[in-house]
Amino acid sequence: DVERTTCPPEKEVHEIDESLIFYKKRELEACVDAALLAAQMDRVDAIPFTYEQLDVLKHKLDELYPQGYPESVIRHLGHLFLKMSPEDIRKWNVTSLETLKALLKVSKGHEMSAQVATLIDRVVVGRGQLDKDTVDTLTAFCPGCLCSLSPERLSSVPPSVIGAVRPQDLDTCGPRQLDVLYPKARLAFQNMSGSEYFVKIRPFLGGAPTEDVKALSQQNVSMDLATFMKLRREAVLPLTVAEVQKLLGPHVEGLKVEEQHSPVRDWILKQRQDDLDTLGLGLQGGIPNGYLILDLSVREALS
């Protein structure tokens, strides 16, 4: 912690200005009034403070605003944002997208994923829902950041906004997030023609149920292997060899490359070997001919 000293008269600070980079840590602590700092935060980012000096300034703001900074201060944090922890950010109430943009720009190139995720969460809470303007801001200034939101927060996305989401924005989304987003995407794109629908829905298919995957297999979509590998394991396992062949079309050959990886490996284990042989890919590990398949899960459910 910064030691307390009195401020030498010649070092008294009446405005936040360039001279402060020549102040030692203890001089900053003694001479900078926290309220002055808060009022002139817009000047701080132009001044190339050292990380140590920024620590002192953060300490001053923390003392002034123990319940969390007001948005007027947050908007102008600039490089001071790099000093914030997720715990600090959780105390904030942020509604302005200008504030979000400013801080996303600052965080670029720094390991700030936890802080950015928390910031975005605070913006969604502050604005009441994940509206189109917020999604547009995220896709423009922080590709992939959409996936930092919890499924609960993502559930506030109106289907009308889904069109603004690009494939790369979903790259880091997990299954639980896609479970939330997929039904919204399905709704958003429901009036499109088959091929156009597939192009739009493809990035969201990691959240699709078996029925929808089966339906796609009837539509000559020629799903690429990358998309297939992102499908939920539970959605892939019930598919027949014929359905997978139809679904992948010419890309079916890729199954050989992926045969050791989930969900392909798990799917192979559930298929009859002679069905797999019809693909002519040399896939091994299917159920040998003549074996009886018992679905124990049904028996367990009845007992």
Epitope: V13, H14, E15, I16, D17, E18, S19, I21, F22, R43, A46, I47, P48, T50, Y51, E52, Q53
Partner: antibody, heavy 123, light 112 residues
Amino acid sequence: QVQLKQSGPGLVQPSQSLSITCTVSGFSLFSYGVHWVRQSPGKGLEWLGVIWSGGSTDYNAAFISRLSISKDNSKSQVFFKMNSLQADDTAMYYCARNGGSMITTLYYAMDYWGQGTSVTVSS
Amino acid sequence: DVVMTQTPLSLPVSLGDQASISCRSSQSLVHSYGNTYLHWYLQKPGQSPKLLIYKVSNRFSGVPDRFSGSGSGTDFTLKISRVEAEDLGVYFCSQSTHIPFTFGGGTKLEIK
């Protein structure tokens, strides 16, 4: 465009004071600091002091007892006053803008200079 | 105070030649976290100094790309790749990491 224009006397009596005004245009003193530098054949370029955008000052310790820098933001003027001049204070005196600003980013070089005020200390 | 030592004092060159000026400081010019406030100025006869390079290697606006700066810590160099007639004058290095700011004694670039 950025300009710094200096006005002040060319001749000063020994033990008297020197006052120079630097009038700036093309930028605001709210955002930029202004340095004072002098140049003499014997001592080369010497940094005398600076008034920062917020009004605070830093002086070269060798001149602190007899130097004062102030400004009037609304008139875009910076005032330099040095007391008790002696013959070895004979030099060309310059005002210069501090590089970068509170709007952009500061880099603490002197990016634009005044035309200079030639000062001779002699009786 | 930080002493800035420039070499050579005088540098005779032919037009089109490369020129190199060295500047050494008596202590490190790295300001606590990374920024190094070492700058180069050119003063032509009868004129005020003009900023050429700031923070070691950044060319100021309007400065031709034949000027380049390099170095770190206490040792710095200004290079002119192909000297032109308009480049003649006195070159000064200066530091603004420590107060008081200080200047080198100057290097006069002149025609051989």
